[in-house]
Amino acid sequence: DAHKSEVAHRFKDLGEENFKALVLIAFAQYLQQCPFEDHVKLVNEVTEFAKTCVADESAENCDKSLHTLFGDKLCTVATLRETYGEMADCCAKQEPERNECFLQHKDDNPNLPRLVRPEVDVMCTAFHDNEETFLKKYLYEIARRHPYFYAPELLFFAKRYKAAFTECCQAADKAACLLPKLDELRDEGKASSAKQRLKCASLQKFGERAFKAWAVARLSQRFPKAEFAEVSKLVTDLTKVHTECCHGDLLECADDRADLAKYICENQDSISSKLKECCEKPLLEKSHCIAEVENDEMPADLPSLAADFVESKDVCKNYAEAKDVFLGMFLYEYARRHPDYSVVLLLRLAKTYETTLEKCCAAADPHECYAKVFDEFKPLVEEPQNLIKQNCELFEQLGEYKFQNALLVRYTKKVPQVSTPTLVEVSRNLGKVGSKCCKHPEAKRMPCAEDYLSVVLNQLCVLHEKTPVSDRVTKCCTESLVNRRPCFSALEVDETYVPKEFNAETFTFHADICTLSEKERQIKKQTALVELVKHKPKATKEQLKAVMDDFAAFVEKCCKADDKETCFAEEGKKLVAASQAALGL
């Protein structure tokens, strides 16, 4: 359905408030260093222009594409070259190359100051003084730090953010009311950003087919009563939504997501019995709720998969006539029967099945060739099961902090070239799999753990891509999306690594560590642990544990001392000497 003016079409569909918010998100995700005020000015200009097009779709420039309009607007920024360097060269290009150029310059780890949370009273005053600016600032700060954040979902976060301030700034104990809510939003926001980053990486690095396969598996687990044709329709629509958002087409993305939510709710009888509550909510909550809805119950008496996919004489005929449809049906049928499997495992099984058919449907005796294909699945299923069992046992034995430390050591030994902040961030997140997933019963552990690990390892991949330092990381990240986790799991100690030179400064600590939050203090200690392993990659667990125990005792002792700084200076030197001796540095 072609519209004379795309910008007018989206303005009318989304409404002014959402239009402005989405344009702000889009601009902040592209120009991540620009000041807030500059973005607000650009957004206001675009909004005023959109209104003229709503009034008269034939008005000058109203027929231009959104990329052209937004790109032209971004290219008016005066300090583009000084602030962004070569990104300014994008402006010399024509659409669609210009937009592709902007996309390529999105920075997953922008050099921006950490967001420091002001005092509650300060925040409440700012909220009351100018609610609109306060909420825009939230969108801006999140969007520029998370350039792939799922824009329509960020609108939902902003709505919750507003609700938290509206409620808590009137409460007797503002802090007790507000801070837990803000912590929850922050943690959920980070998780949401990372999940969306994997979707965009899947689309951009591995293509639409890879994303569609992921979506078939996930939606089939979630909606096992839905017919294959219904799941296929949802997959097609969902792929369009995410392709748009990942491509910076945020207005189209939000609009199409709303249409998809509407369709799902209108057809919930043929999709899932679990959608009723979601579909009673307002739009943003509804879309979020649908995205998080629990798996429906599996239909009773589903027949064996072997009949259609192994025993049938038409297996090769069906495969050859429509490969992706047949493989899609296989994935659908397998996934709806296995909510207990991770999506990535299901995709590995489908890949194995595809490889077998590619081979066997060219063989002299196809049936004999593929007859045992399901037997090949057994080791693929057992590998993540065993890994999760072992790691959950380790987590229960150690607790989260020490489990993270075990992973820090493990991953630093695998890929010691990776920067210390990245190793700390990624290993801490990998370690969170324990508290997130190990509490679940067996049937829910694998989908929770392995699909979460896929999200975390994607963080490593996108951070590493910006400044590649390890061929092993590049190999695991680029060879196969679904085999990333097994690839990293299989890495042993990097024997080619030349240990880092010892630098006493790295292990010098000051009294400021005492005032840090428990989390920040952990990060300091974990940073030291990574550096230690980089200096002594062959150190044993016992050696590292002894040094880390001494280090913890040292911090505790000096933080209790009257003259903390002196304690850190003197005891620190002793600790470094003792550690060097213990590790033979």
Epitope: C316, K317, E358, K359, C361, A363, A364, D365
Partner: antibody, heavy 118, light 106 residues
Amino acid sequence: QVQLQQSGAELVRPGSSVKISCKASGYAFSNYWMNWVKQRPGQGLEWIGQIYPGDGDTYYNGRFKGKATLTADKSPTTAYMQLSSLTSEDSAVYVCARGVLLGSFDYWGQGTTLTVSS
Amino acid sequence: QIVLTQSPAIMSASPGEKVTMTCSASSSVSYMHWYQQKSGTSPKRWIYDTSKLASGVPVRFSGSGSGTSYSLTIRSMEAEDAATYYCQQWGSNPLTFGAGTKLEIK
């Protein structure tokens, strides 16, 4: 582009063995069956067997079991057929051919002429 | 094993004439493929998966059939079509070829 280059003509004594090669290029050698076909002068085509270089799986025409042995080497992307206990009946042109989905042979080598004579 | 019988063994056709040759299988087969061979050269895949034309094959050729009965048709014979045509079945081990139909130009 896909190419199958076979070794040159062979003249051998009865009772001996011969190994014919087929060097593949221009495609993922491991992922396609390599078939071998026999053609005697003025006669039709006879399928000998096939090998899957990816894992070494083979299928043979029963008539050639014990006569032909198929192997493949992934690093020089070459398939081989060894013929043993040769007799004049084995004199023929032997051709390698790449097998694809649903069993057709889309690319063929130029053929190797084997003459068994005392 | 499945025996493929091609008929006729030899045939000739004038330029512009319609040509049909058949391949009959001793049991039902899944797919039939056809190859063209000219003297002194290796066979070339001509029609595959029963009815698909191989790359570069003129559209005057067509293939059809199912079960035990298959055919190759040339809508309008041309001189360059003179060759031997072999059918080959897939779906039963061992793979087998017909004895060939030799097509000559009148």
